[in-house]
């Protein structure tokens, strides 16, 4: 059966300064190939977070990730600031042997939306 | 049973303002996002706005902001739609849709109520 | 923000006949693809969200399946009360969700 990847959250709603954990679960590991995360869509997508061991600013995974069999791929952002607002896309991947990893499956998105302190 | 009635609806002339009013019951209305989409006369549909249950997250269409508001009052289990400076291409059904608890799609809708803006 | 496009425009089909209304849209939007239903003085009616879940209520004539960019409606035999118009909506690109310019499924 195809990979689902689930956001359970519409919408998370953050106070600026504060940290916030967007939420996202995989059914399954299968096909291989990394998840990531990203805000926006089309054309103005920006790459947030990808769980292949980059360092990304202020962002980190909240469950253990090298654990086998791990389903949960949420990240909590750190020092939310008025930029961060907009819609989070988990997306999964599977990994391409010389061609680029091909996009197979996405959560719905969750808004976040930045409160002034 | 959900049930969304709105009201408010008439003819005003450009540049005029109305208030539209959506009575929401048979669902417990504060957990739920709340939109307006409208339909002109022989026309597809088009999303105007939509609200969370908190009233915090507030979006618009493009061709509306700066000129509609959209509020709630949830302890009177009600949806809003402040519509001022209308144009003649405001002219349109109006309906009230409740969205679904996990994604943004409508689970229910009103009736609709007619706005016309003509001179 | 992600255009649909319905296909046809008007489809013209005798009662017990199968229809078959197409969407399509301008990025991926994976399966966040609802279908709703509308008639004349009667609120819109959701028939199908996730592409292919039908709503409560929802006889099994209907049937929706696609995913990405190319979507399908089904409804295998046309009943009198089927005649109407369809709407697409996507959810996964929002805000603005966006419908798309529907078809109307009209007796021969």
């Known amino acids: 059966t195809e990979v689902k990847v689930t956001q359970p959250e519409k919408s998370v709603s953050v106070a600026a300064g504060d940290s916030t954990i967007l939420n996202c679960t995989v059914t399954s590991l299968l096909p291989v190939g990394p998840i990531r995360w990203y805000r926006g869509v089309g054309q103005s997508r920006l790459l947030i977070y990808s769980f292949t061991g980059e360092h990304f600013p202020r962002i980190r995974n909240v469950s253990d990730t090298t654990k086998r069999n791990n389903m949960d791929f949420s990240i909590r952002i750190s020092n939310v600031t008025p930029e961060d607002a907009g819609t989070y896309y988990c997306v999964k991947f599977q990994r391409g042997s010389s061609e680029p990893d091909t996009e197979i499956q996405s959560g719905g998105g969750t808004e976040v939306y930045v409160l002034a302190k | 049973d959900v049930q969304l009635v709105e009201s408010g609806g008439g003819v005003v002339r450009p540049g005029e303002s109305l208030r539209l009013s959506c009575a929401a019951s048979g669902f417990t209305f504060s957990s739920y996002d709340m939109n307006w989409v409208r339909q002109a006369p022989g026309e597809g549909l088009e999303w105007v706005s939509l609200?969370?249950?908190?009233?915090?997250?507030?979006y618009y269409a493009d061709s509306v902001k700066g000129r509609f508001t959209i509020s709630r009052d949830n302890s009177k289990n009600t949806l809003y739609l402040q519509m001022n400076s209308l144009r003649a291409e405001d002219t349109a059904v109006y309906y009230c849709?409740?969205?679904?608890?996990?994604?943004?799609?409508?689970?229910?809708w009103g009736l609709g109520t007619l706005v016309t803006v003509s001179s | 923000e992600t255009v649909l496009t319905q296909s046809p425009g008007t489809l013209t089909l005798s009662p017990g006949e199968r229809a078959t209304l197409t969407c399509r849209a301008s990025q991926s939007v994976y399966t966040y693809l609802a279908w709703y239903q509308e008639k004349p003085g009667q609120a819109p009616r959701l028939l199908i969200y996730g592409a292919s879940s039908r709503a409560t209520g929802i006889p099994d004539r209907f049937s929706g399946s696609g995913s990405g960019t190319e979507f399908t409606l089904t409804i295998s035999s046309l009943q009198s009360e089927d005649f109407a118009v369809y709407y697409c909506q996507q959810y996964y690109d929002r805000p603005p969700l966006t419908f798309g310019g529907g078809t109307k499924v009209e007796i021969k």
């Open positions: 849709a409740k969205e679904n608890n996990r994604y943004r799609f409508f689970d229910d």
């Open positions: 609200i969370s249950g908190s009233g915090e997250i507030i």
